[in-house]
């Protein structure tokens, strides 16, 4: 139904706390460089205005769209051009072009320092003094670094953050309580960020149809007892919600997400037997719980889908009459039978089936032509299965750090033109797949591995798009979203690359490395490894192992030395010389 004042409608639906949080996220995602204090001032102004509209929907400007209201606020910021350059040009445009312009200026890799967690005591003091401000800072810091973070989900993580602090700040050893719990929240939030970025990429590059296909496959896997019509309804709603969030309509997105959760809980009988526990929770937790829900049990004795999709003489007629419905049904039937496949694989199979019908239905004997489609699926299924097997075996052999290094070497050889920090970030994230997925039961490994890798590679594509340097990466990133992972896996050593000349300063280290946290030490070593590969793309595994082993020993020895600086200064050049020799 139409509302006189959209902002009043959203304020009433969401409540003041969530409304303010979402407005803060929206502003932080659009203007990523503004300090918290500036944003919070805008948030308060918008909230006060929304309250006047709740009191009187006919009040001045209350009938304006939320984009108009938000855009006007952003464009009124003093010195916008000084801080944001050409983003200020957006302000000369009218809606909806102005909002589109803001979206195009979102920066996936903003020049912001890594978010440093304060000391436990300091954190607890500032949390206890002003919890609202503390959590506001959290929303702001995460949102500006992840401009596509799914806003209602970020509210959920802020709630989790709040829970952890409330619990741990009363403990005697605050750090021991906070560190593992906050690490767990951070890890989940980072994965959520790359997953949502992938959804927005899908929406931006390939439109709603592509996203809806993804949603149909995912929902069919989770709710195999639901009928196709139910799955289609859920997928349509989910597509709308994600379109809104990716498009910056965060209030509408969060409101619609809560509505979808409500609908699912009112219709459990036709969706899934697993929903009840989620439905007893408050709104943010309920939606999150439903998003992470385990798969319902597959009905036993589902028949072979060959009858309807291969053996039926009317396949071409059914396909021609309603292509999207027929293909949607195929995707639904296949996905509900295969929770052990990744969504990417299911979409590749559906795409293969569509291509087969397009070809065969134009031929003289269609059934004879499409009758072999099953055999044609085999390599598509075997490829990711083999990928999981070989990578999990390698992870089990090397552990996470060693596995990251193996991936780093592999990807630096594939795309040596890509900047070292980007390669290191990608390899570290790709390497985490082992810890995340390889320990799972067999049936959960493939979907976990492939869908996670796809999301990480999407991040690589998004960063590469900003400054394209590798033709191979551009080629993999330009193709279909579901073909990206196989495309990257198939890349080999880039023979066109002219090796980087050996620069001693790249491999010169100082005593400051000794005081770095383990993670930062690893990044330093991995940076050196990537640079080595760029210098010698065809270095053997043994050569790289020798050099990296030498390097580790050198750091270890000098960090234990009485005069660290002197050790690094004298031993460093020897290490560089030995490394050059080992790689000659």
């Amino acid at each position: 139904e139409a509302h006189k004042s959209e902002i009043a409608h959203r304020f009433k639906d969401l409540g003041e706390q969530h409304f303010k949080g979402l407005v803060l996220i929206a502003f932080s995602q659009y203007l990523q460089k503004c300090p918290y204090e500036e944003h919070i001032k805008l948030v308060q102004e918008v909230t006060d205005f929304a309250k006047t509209c709740v009191a009187d929907e006919n009040a001045e400007n209350c009938d304006k769209s939320i984009h108009t209201l938000f855009g006007d606020k952003l464009c009124a910021i003093p010195k916008l051009r000084d801080n944001y350059g050409e983003l200020a040009d957006c302000c000369a445009k009218q809606e909806p072009e102005r909002n589109e312009c803001f979206l195009q200026h979102k920066d996936d890799n903003p020049n912001l320092p890594p978010f440093q967690r304060p000391e436990a005591e300091a954190m607890c003091t500032s949390f206890q003094e002003n919890p609202t401000s503390f959590l506001g800072h959290y929303l702001h810091e995460v949102a500006r670094r992840h401009p596509y973070f799914y806003a209602p989900e970020l509210l959920y993580y802020a709630e989790k953050y709040n829970e952890v602090l409330t619990q741990c700040c009363t403990e005697s050893d605050k750090a021991a309580c906070l560190t593992p719990k906050l690490d767990a929240v951070k890890e989940k939030a980072l994965v959520a960020a790359v997953r949502q970025r992938m959804k927005c990429s899908s929406m931006q590059r390939f439109g709603e149809r592509a996203f809806k296909a993804w949603a149909v496959a995912r929902m069919s896997q989770r709710f195999p007892n639901a009928e196709f019509a139910e799955i289609t309804k859920l997928a349509t709603d989910l597509t709308k919600i994600n379109k809104e969030c990716c498009h910056g309509d965060l209030l509408e997105c969060a409101d619609d997400r809560a509505e979808l959760a409500k609908y699912m809980c009112e219709n459990q009988a036709t969706i899934s037997s697993k929903l009840q526990a989620c439905c007893d929770k408050p709104v943010l937790q309920k939606s999150q719980c439903l998003a992470e829900i385990e798969h319902d049990n597959i009905p036993a004795d589902l028949p072979s889908i060959a009858a309807d999709f291969v053996e039926d003489k009317e396949v071409c007629k059914n396909y021609a009459e309603a292509k999207d419905v027929f293909l949607g049904t195929f995707l639904y039937e296949y996905s509900r039978r295969h929770p052990d496949y990744s969504v990417s694989l299911l979409l590749r199979l559906a795409k293969k089936y569509e291509a087969t019908l397009e070809k065969c239905c134009a031929e003289g004997d269609p059934p004879a032509c499409y009758g072999t489609v099953l055999a044609e699926f085999q390599p598509l299924v075997e490829e990711p299965k083999n990928l999981v097997k070989t990578n999990c075996e390698l992870y089990e052999k090397l552990g996470e750090y060693g596995f990251q290094n193996a991936i780093l070497v592999r990807y630096t050889q594939k795309a040596p033109q890509v900047s070292t920090p980007t390669l290191v970030e990608a390899a570290r994230n790709l390497g985490r797949v082992g810890t995340k997925c390889c320990t799972l039961p067999e049936a959960q490994r493939l979907p976990c591995v492939e869908d996670y890798l796809s999301a990480i590679l999407n991040r690589l594509c998004v960063l590469h798009e900003k400054t394209p340097v590798s033709e191979k990466v551009t080629k993999c990133c330009s193709g279909s979203l579901v073909e990206r992972r196989p495309c990257f896996s198939a890349l080999t050593v880039d023979e066109t690359y002219v090796p980087k000349e050996f620069k001693a300063e790249t491999f010169t280290f100082h005593s400051d490395i000794c005081t770095l946290p383990d993670k930062e030490k690893q990044i330093k070593k991995q940076t050196a490894l990537a640079e080595l590969v760029k210098h010698k793309p065809k270095a053997t595994e043994d050569q790289l192992k020798t050099v990296m082993g030498d390097f580790a020993q050198f750091v270890d020895k000098c960090c234990k030395a009485a005069d660290k600086d002197n050790c690094f200064a004298t031993e460093g050049p020897n290490l560089v010389a030995r490394s050059k020799e080992a790689l000659a």
Epitope: A300, D301, S304, R337, H338, D340, L374, Q378, V381
Partner: nanobody
Framework: EVQLVESGGGVVQPGDSLRLSCAAS????????MGWFRQAPGKEREFVSA????????YYANSVKGRFTISRDNSKNTVYLQLNSLRPEDTALYYC?????????????????WGQGTLVTVSS
């Protein structure tokens, strides 16, 4: 991890019968689709027959329809293949396979667990 062990193979004359058995262990048998495949010397592995979890659906390759019968006993964690009117072209190594999730029943790549096989030789 499901383990499958086939038995019942042997040397028979054309027109004779055999009953193959496949005993499963290590998983919840009643949640698996069970299938039989065969591989003749020098040929590719081919689908023979499959049966759904509660025996509601059965599938057969055209070459064995009307001669072979698949059945299962979930209480004994065993699947059977009754081979009647055997022909020389039925000579092959017969494999039992289990699939937790399947769309096709007839596609070998949808089966995750395989036995070592039992040899059936039909010769006069």
């Amino acid at each position: 991890e499901v383990q499958l062990v086939e038995s019942g193979g042997g040397v028979v004359q054309p027109g004779d019968s055999l009953r193959l058995s496949c005993a499963a262990s290590g998983g919840t048998f009643s949640t698996y689709v069970m299938g039989w495949f065969r591989q003749a010397p020098g040929k590719e592995r081919e689908f023979v027959s499959a049966i759904s979890q509660n025996s509601i659906h059965t599938y057969y390759a055209n070459s064995v329809k009307g001669r072979f019968t698949i059945s299962r006993d979930n209480s004994k964690n065993t699947v059977y293949l009754q081979l009647n009117s055997l022909r020389p072209e039925d000579t092959a190594l017969y494999y039992c396979a289990a699939s937790r999730f399947t769309s096709w029943y007839t596609a070998d790549y949808e089966y995750d667990y395989w036995g070592q096989g039992t040899l059936v030789t039909v010769s006069s």
